[in-house]
């Protein structure tokens, strides 16, 4: 992995251990928890990052209303099962044999069941709505400047192709970033919107996953953009399947 060559570290993932025992004696970086080799020239998949996190030593100017089928990650952290490519397996189970189905970003999309629960396919999350509230500022940010800065951030920091940033909405103090990426649109080598959103979420929380880089310093025309609340909604290509009991709760 050439990006890790110089001093044998992984610039895009601090949750790795790198050693000079790769092919040809080159630097090779492996994700904590799974032991899988990672490509340090791009983002690591969210599944491998969550697994590493769990294993680490306990050390139009109108805002979008999320669809009724939008999912929010209310379950928090868990130790996921990842497939050979580092993506989430469609069915996840905990150590007490409670199982559930997840989407491509690892968010639960069914009621919890037992080991007999079937999850036939990994349903793709094709639309992510990142809802931010920024801290009070002297005045509102210029919308086009804000739009340009956030698009630059996703392109340069997270290597997400600009076509996948569908829109940036702003009504002070709320900012919404829409990411869209259908299965048919995602080419080999394209960063997944779910991975980009996860890196962004960790950056916003001051928990950057990048090695040795300073934290995220977001500025719009020199004015710091400080986020005080983040909500992320996930929309799947197939709507989730929850019982009415949950929907009315």
């Amino acid at each position: 992995h050439t990006a890790a060559q110089d001093n044998c570290t992984c610039p895009t993932n601090k949750m790795t251990v790198c050693s000079p025992d790769g092919p040809g004696g080159r630097c090779q970086c492996r994700a904590l928890g799974s032991g899988m080799a990672v490509d340090c020239s791009t983002l690591t998949s969210k599944c491998l990052l969550l697994k590493a996190r769990m294993s680490a030593p306990k050390n139009a100017r109108t805002l979008v209303r999320p669809s009724e089928h939008a999912l929010v990650d209310n379950d928090g952290l868990y130790d996921p099962d990842c497939d050979p490519e580092g993506r989430f397996k469609a069915r996840q189970c905990n150590q007490t044999s409670v199982c559930w189905c997840v989407n491509s970003v690892g968010v639960r999309r069914t009621d919890k069941g037992d080991l007999s629960l079937r999850c036939d396919e990994l349903v793709r999350t094709h639309h992510i709505l990142i809802d931010l509230r920024h801290r009070p500022t002297a005045g509102a940010f210029n919308h086009s400047d804000l739009d340009a800065e956030l698009r630059r951030l996703f392109r340069e920091r997270y290597r997400l192709h600009p076509k996948f940033v569908a829109a940036v909405h702003y009504e002070q103090p709320t900012i919404q970033i829409e990411l869209r990426q259908n299965t048919s649109q995602k080419a080999a080598g394209d960063v997944d919107i779910g991975d980009a959103a996860y890196y962004f979420e960790r950056d916003i929380k001051g928990e950057s996953l990048f090695q040795g880089r300073g934290g995220l310093d977001l500025r719009v025309r020199g004015e710091p953009l400080q986020v005080e609340r983040t909500l992320i909604y996930y929309l799947d290509e197939i709507p989730p399947k929850f019982s009415m009991k949950r929907l009315t709760a």
Epitope: V17, G22, G35
Partner: antibody, heavy 116, light 111 residues
């Protein structure tokens, strides 16, 4: 040159513990994983786990969780493996090796015999 | 866990002929760049010795008569021409994900 020197053979009682060592020389100890492998006659090779001395990170084969504990002392460039609650099933040769997979240098092995 | 199945369990090859050992993984252990499969030789009373790393990379000091090939789930170790000193047990091992399992071994005898 790179060398991994393992501690001598152990004869131990069932139910007790044993701690074996693997002293590294000839390379930067903190830069490489040290893996541990079990070999019983007729049972081939079993990967137990590995440790990265540079940060103390460990990985274990689920089968050996609770049985094996891997540690490393960077000041003496020595990796250790402790085996607990020993039974006859733990009688085997245990090897340490440098590297995650594709271990390029191996210790000579430590024979552990569990007998009453 | 990834299961590695070696075949044959044993084989006898005439001096100077070709020995072919197969290792099949229960899932792919390759990316577009590399295959995370390695081959070892073990003689009685000795630790394993690394022969081939990353499916086809010959370790330094290992004779050129040893070669490795394959990707995805199917890998092969070839020895040609075999020599007397190649009598040993050969193991494959993956390093795709934890645990880094070994194959069951192939015992090679020279006729």
């Amino acid at each position: 040159q790179v060398q991994l020197q393992q501690s001598g053979a152990e004869l131990v009682r069932p139910g007790t513990s044993v701690k074996m060592s693997c002293k590294a020389a000839g390379y930067t100890f903190t830069n490489y994983w040290i893996g541990w492998v079990k070999q019983r006659p007729g049972h081939g090779l079993e990967w137990i786990g590995d440790i990265y001395p540079g940060g103390g990170y460990t990985n274990y084969n689920e089968k050996f969780k609770g049985k094996a504990t891997l540690t490393a002392d960077t000041s003496s460039s020595t990796a250790y493996m402790q085996l607990s609650s020993l039974t006859s099933e733990d009688s085997a040769i245990y090897y340490c090796a440098r590297g995650t997979g594709g271990g390029d240098y191996w210790g000579q092995g430590t024979l552990v015999t569990v007998s009453a | 866990d990834i299961v590695l199945t070696q075949s044959p369990a044993s084989l006898a090859v005439s001096l100077g002929q070709r020995a072919t050992i197969s290792c099949r993984a229960s899932q792919s252990v390759s990316t577009s760049s590399y295959s995370y499969m390695h081959w070892y030789q073990q003689k009685p009373g000795q630790p394993p010795k690394l022969l081939i790393k990353y499916a086809s990379n010959l370790e330094s000091g290992v004779p050129a008569r040893f070669s490795g090939s394959g990707s995805g789930t199917d890998f092969t170790l070839n020895i040609h021409p075999v020599e007397e000193e190649d009598t040993a047990t050969y193991y494959c091992q993956h390093s795709w994900e934890i645990p880094y399992t070994f194959g069951g071994g192939t015992k090679l005898e020279i006729k």
